[in-house]
Interface confidence: medium
């Protein structure tokens, strides 16, 4: 029965005399008067079986002590650790010439675990063991004897097991413990590859090459290899494994990404939080599912936020010129979180009697610069039929529009070709300018060409250069433009609309808002 004692992880104990409970029962030769089994104590009051001999008075001592058979367990080289006390011959009176201060260590390989006798000739000598510390009689009085620890190794071994033997030639020795062990490189994980327990090589300089296997939920990047050194230490890790998609490295293991996290590829990266507008509901996600109403385009990386189609374009303006129409609009208020916004134009030809009966315009109509995938916010449509009602839809589209097309993404206008629109307005005046508003007034166009249905005022900050404009419509020939910024230059255009469509815009009127209220009369030229 062997008690548990703690030794380094790279040592595998084959024999430990201190852990044996009960008698060791090793074979001594001679049976009497040589080595004697003596029970002493350890610090926990547990008996330790030791072997002692002290025949220092008599010459020509040849006392042998042989262990039981020790299994090799596949080790090619084993280590023997001996802890012992040894008496200083100088402290013993009258023993000159007979007292020795060394003993000899031998081994014998055998497949037979039941050899009953010691045949000295079968044993090979490992070494002569001497003490670093020998004790005198005074030490015994002081109750202290330092233990000597000597370690020897022997190999290569080839048989199933072996016996050790201790030869005393006339010393005063107590073998307090004998431990036999071999060295291994203990099971370890490096670079996500597991390397098994590996017994060291046969000689003290050999390196054993070991191939590792990737831990669960990982895959080889480069073939993982390490070398097991003779001292039981792993050396020179080569290659590695990477955690699979949906897994990340934690303490040498590949753990599934937590809920709300993902990892798309086999890399050494950690799991990342799901991008905006997406989620994962399982552990080990390789991508995140888009929230309801949000989508990911085919070429969007898993790391990109989920996006949605844009809202409709704003402020659509049409300008009819016989069988041509110019359309202009502003960007949508909501781009859906994407940069790849473009515009498609849908042209429908509608019956005069029933505007609801509309058909596609067909291939005879031409668009400048193009009908679909427009990057600008204007288009010219030509080669329309005269005296015909047309409805034009401007669709804002992005990379995910195809997943959720909706009328909410378009704006439309209906026009009739081949009717004269009103002429442009000649004079626009700023009647009153304050910090936050401008009061405009204008005259009717010289040629209204019919009943003027409404006026449209287009204005923008001068330095915005028409990139972002606003529209105000009114039936009167004046209007108050409110919500302006103080001390800012604005440009105003006005045009009239009849049943035939819009006329051209007036010449620009530039007005700068004030810090102090004052009345300014404009004459169509710049006003400050």
């Amino acid at each position: 029965v062997t008690g548990s004692r703690v030794y380094p992880a790279n040592e595998v104990t084959l024999l430990d005399s201190r852990s044996v409970q009960g008698e060791l029962g090793w074979i001594a030769s001679p049976l009497e008067g040589g080595w004697e089994e003596v029970s002493i104590m350890d610090e926990k009051n547990t008996p330790i079986r030791t072997y002692q001999v002290c025949n220092v008075m008599e010459a020509s001592q040849n006392n042998w002590l042989r262990t039981d058979w020790i299994t090799r367990e596949g080790a090619q080289r084993v280590y023997i650790e001996i802890k012992f006390t040894l008496r200083d011959c100088n402290s013993l009176p009258g023993v000159m010439g007979t007292c020795k201060e060394t003993f000899n260590l031998y081994y014998y390989e055998s497949d037979n675990d039941k050899e009953r006798f010691i045949r000295e000739s079968q044993f090979g000598k490992i070494d002569t063991i001497a003490a670093d510390e020998s004790f005198t009689q005074v030490d015994i009085g002081d109750r202290i004897m330092k233990l000597n620890t000597e370690i020897r190794d022997v190999g290569p071994l080839s048989k199933k097991g072996f016996y050790l033997a201790f030869q005393d030639v006339g010393a005063c020795i107590a073998l307090v413990s004998v431990r036999v062990f071999y060295k291994k490189c203990p099971l370890t994980v490096r670079n996500l590859a597991q390397f098994p327990d590996t017994i060291t090589g046969a000689d003290t300089s050999s390196l054993v090459e070991v191939r590792g296997s990737c831990v669960n939920n990982s895959e080889e990047k480069d073939v993982p290899k390490m070398y097991c050194g003779a001292d039981g230490e792993w050396l020179v890790p080569i290659g590695n494994c990477l955690c699979n998609a949906g897994h990340e490295e934690q303490n040498g293991e590949c753990q599934a990404c937590k809920i709300g996290y993902y990892k798309a590829l086999s890399t050494d990266a950690s799991c990342a939080k799901c991008p905006p507008h997406s989620y994962s509901v399982w552990e080990g996600a390789t991508s995140c599912t888009c929230d309801r109403g949000f989508f990911r385009a085919d070429n969007d990386a898993a790391s990109m936020p989920c996006t949605r189609p844009p809202s409709a374009p704003l402020n659509l303006i049409s300008n009819v010129n016989e069988t041509s129409v110019n359309l202009e609009w502003s960007s949508p208020q909501n781009t859906g979180g994407r940069q790849d916004i473009s515009y498609n134009v849908v042209c429908k030809k509608c019956g005069a009697g029933d505007p609801s009966k509309c058909r596609p315009c067909g291939s005879g109509v031409h668009y400048t610069p193009q009908q679909n995938g427009l990057k600008t916010t204007r288009v010219s449509i030509t080669d329309l039929l005269a005296h015909t009602n047309y409805t034009f839809e401007i669709w804002a589209v992005n990379g995910v529009s195809k997943y959720n097309p909706s009328p909410d993404q378009s704006v439309s206008v209906t026009v009739t070709t081949n009717q004269a629109a009103p002429s442009s307005i000649a004079l626009v005046q700023a009647k009153e300018v304050t910090r936050y508003s401008v009061a405009l007034a204008w005259l009717e166009p010289d040629r209204p060409n019919g009943v003027i249905l409404e006026y449209e005022v287009k204005y923008y900050e001068k330095d915005q250069n028409e990139r972002s404009y606003r529209i105000v419509r009114t039936a009167a020939r004046n209007t108050d433009i409110k919500g302006l910024n103080p001390l800012t230059s604005y440009v105003f255009h006005v045009r009239a609309r009849t049943a035939a469509g819009y006329g051209d815009f007036s010449e620009p009127l530039e007005v700068t808002t004030n810090t102090v209220p004052s009345r300014i009369i404009g004459d169509g030229a710049n006003s400050t």
Epitope: M41, K83, L92, I144, L147
Partner: antibody, heavy 126, light 112 residues
């Protein structure tokens, strides 16, 4: 269990010698330190010397050097203490006491006197 | 030689009460291995001494836990948490760091 059985009481003349025996049982005799301690009537304890049988020779208190001899017979597990040139002040109870050797991972030391004999009264009188 | 001095030499105690005996050595009993080489013994009337405490603070096998040893270097104490009638006798401290092994002069514990 461990037992130390001492020889019987002795009456000795001044100048003579006395040899007290202590037979051990219940443990490995050779591995334990055997001490001898005496106690004069109404007095305290006085250490005389000791021996580890396996290691042969004994060591003694300076006070008794030259007058005391401690030996051990491994074959009978018996320790002996012989005191010569007896004087009246050597009248005392003589005890044998054993101390086990204790080994840690780095050293061995001798524990306290775990077991005592029953004592042998030696009277020195003319 | 190491001189051991005990106090008090006589200690009358009421049963159930605690008792404390002091022992002072003329030089340190602390070995480099961390152990204090001091033992305590009790000699009951008409009996051989018996080991109570070894190496300063370790209770010997079979000794009741009301006995405890403490101290280090040159100052040591034996404490009995609740004295019982069977605890009467002479208590000795002993140093075993170096030869000759020496004892204190003894403290006689008696019941009031």
């Amino acid at each position: 269990q461990v037992q130390l059985q001492q020889s019987g009481a002795e009456v000795k003349k001044p100048g003579s010698s006395v040899k007290v025996s202590c037979k051990a049982s219940g443990y490995t005799f050779t591995g334990y330190y055997m001490h001898w301690v005496r106690q004069a009537p109404g007095q305290g304890l006085e250490w005389m010397g000791g021996i580890i049988p396996i290691f042969g020779t004994a060591n003694y208190a300076q006070k008794f050097q030259g007058r005391v001899t401690i030996t051990a017979d491994k074959s009978t597990s018996t320790a002996y203490m012989e005191l010569s040139s007896l004087r009246s002040e050597d009248t005392a109870v003589y005890y044998c006491a054993t101390a086990p050797m204790v080994c840690s991972s780095t050293s061995c030391y001798l524990r306290g006197f775990d077991y005592w004999g029953q004592g042998t009264l030696v009277t020195v009188s003319s | 030689d190491v001189v051991m001095t005990q106090s008090p030499l006589s200690l009358p105690v009421t049963p159930g009460e605690p008792a404390s005996i002091s022992c002072r050595s003329s030089q340190s009993l602390l070995h480099s291995n961390g152990y204090n080489y001091l033992d305590w013994y009790l000699q009951k009337p008409g009996q051989s001494p018996q080991l109570l405490i070894y190496l300063g603070s370790n209770r010997a096998s079979g000794v009741p836990d009301r006995f405890s040893g403490s101290g280090s270097g040159t100052d040591f104490t034996l404490k009995i948490s609740r004295v019982e009638a069977e605890d009467v006798g002479v208590y000795y401290c002993m140093q075993a760091l170096q030869t000759p092994i020496t004892f204190g002069q003894g403290t006689r514990l008696e019941i009031k």
